[in-house]
């Protein structure tokens, strides 16, 4: 089959890293620097991606594969193939149009990217709050009150969740 195909189309003999030159009797010409063809039989080479500005090179372009970019420190990738770089925020913050903002009370973000998410509502699972939530951490749910042994029933219930950094009144 391969032989039949090459008789029909001389370009099928051109390997990755070359292009089939229609203007030169379909000879295989190497891709010029900073371009590539990742499959055989191509009539063009693709221009290599250039990782500039906030992008940095994770993998150099070769004659058979494109460059790969990631983001400079303080930024993270978004989109397929790291098509965009977005600013990092601190844990306990989210990125808004006006920059990094602290998570509102009752929400948290434990990463440098993404949005603040509501604390888990322990009572929905019939559980109680074992450790209060903060801007950076979700609440930790404990066993449901019914699960507590009779001897442990005198344990002081957890204080209501409050904004971290605030002293108890």
């Amino acid at each position: 089959f391969e032989r039949t195909r090459s008789l029909q189309d001389p370009c099928s003999n051109c390997p990755a890293g070359t292009f089939c030159d229609n203007n030169r009797n379909q000879i295989c010409s190497p891709c010029p620097p900073n371009s590539f063809s990742s499959a055989g039989g191509q009539r063009t080479c693709d221009i290599c991606r250039q990782c500039k500005g906030v992008f940095r090179t994770r993998k150099e372009c070769s004659s058979t594969s494109n460059a790969e970019c990631d983001c400079t420190p303080g930024f993270h990738c978004l989109g397929a193939g790291c098509s965009m770089c977005e600013q990092d925020c601190k844990q306990g913050q989210e990125l808004t149009k006006k920059g990094c903002k602290d998570c509102c009370f009752g929400t948290f973000n434990d990463q440098k990217r993404g949005i603040c998410r509501p604390w888990t509502n322990c009572s929905l699972d019939g559980k109680s709050v074992l450790v209060n939530g903060t801007k950076e951490r979700d609440v930790v749910c404990g066993p449901s009150p019914a699960d507590l042994s009779p001897g442990a029933s005198s344990v002081t219930p957890p204080a209501p969740a409050r904004e971290p950094g605030h002293s108890p009144q």
Epitope: F19, N22, N23, C31, P32, S35, R43, T44, D46, I47
Partner: nanobody, 120 residues
Framework: EVQLVESGGGLVQPGGSLRLSCAAS????????VGWFRQAPGKEREYVGT??????HYGDFENNRFTISRDNSKNTVYLQMNNLRPEDTAVYYC???????????????QGQGTQVTVSS
């Protein structure tokens, strides 16, 4: 918005020379191959050549009479045409693409063109 503006066309006698320029605004040529096409009245569009990364590829009609070069500092690409013939009369278009050569591809962007007339 990317804009490509060609200039340098005009009337020239057979055997004469012209240098066409293509300037880009809104984006640099850094990431693109730059090509030239031409279209004569009542004829199909014809591939002239493509420039990328120090290499040039040309259509099969030009017989070393045409040379594409690039000045990165001016963000401009040139088409030097020597020993012009009446059959070179056409509108010449500058185009950019992420493909090299552009002989078989539809460009990503193309200018409005500049008229070249070769006549005595």
């Amino acid at each position: 918005e990317v804009q490509l503006v060609e200039s340098g066309g005009g009337l020239v006698q057979p055997g004469g020379s012209l240098r066409l320029s293509c300037a880009a605004s809104g984006r640099t040529f850094d990431n693109y191959a730059v090509g030239w096409f031409r279209q004569a009245p009542g004829k199909e569009r014809e591939y002239v050549g493509t420039y990328w990364s120090g290499y040039a590829h040309y259509g099969d009609f030009e017989n070393n009479r045409f040379t594409i070069s690039r000045d990165n500092s001016k963000n401009t690409v040139y088409l030097q045409m020597n020993n012009l013939r009446p059959e070179d009369t056409a509108v010449y278009y500058c185009a950019i693409s992420l493909k090299y050569p552009m002989a078989t591809v539809t460009p990503d962007y193309q200018g409005q063109g500049t008229q070249v007339t070769v006549s005595s």
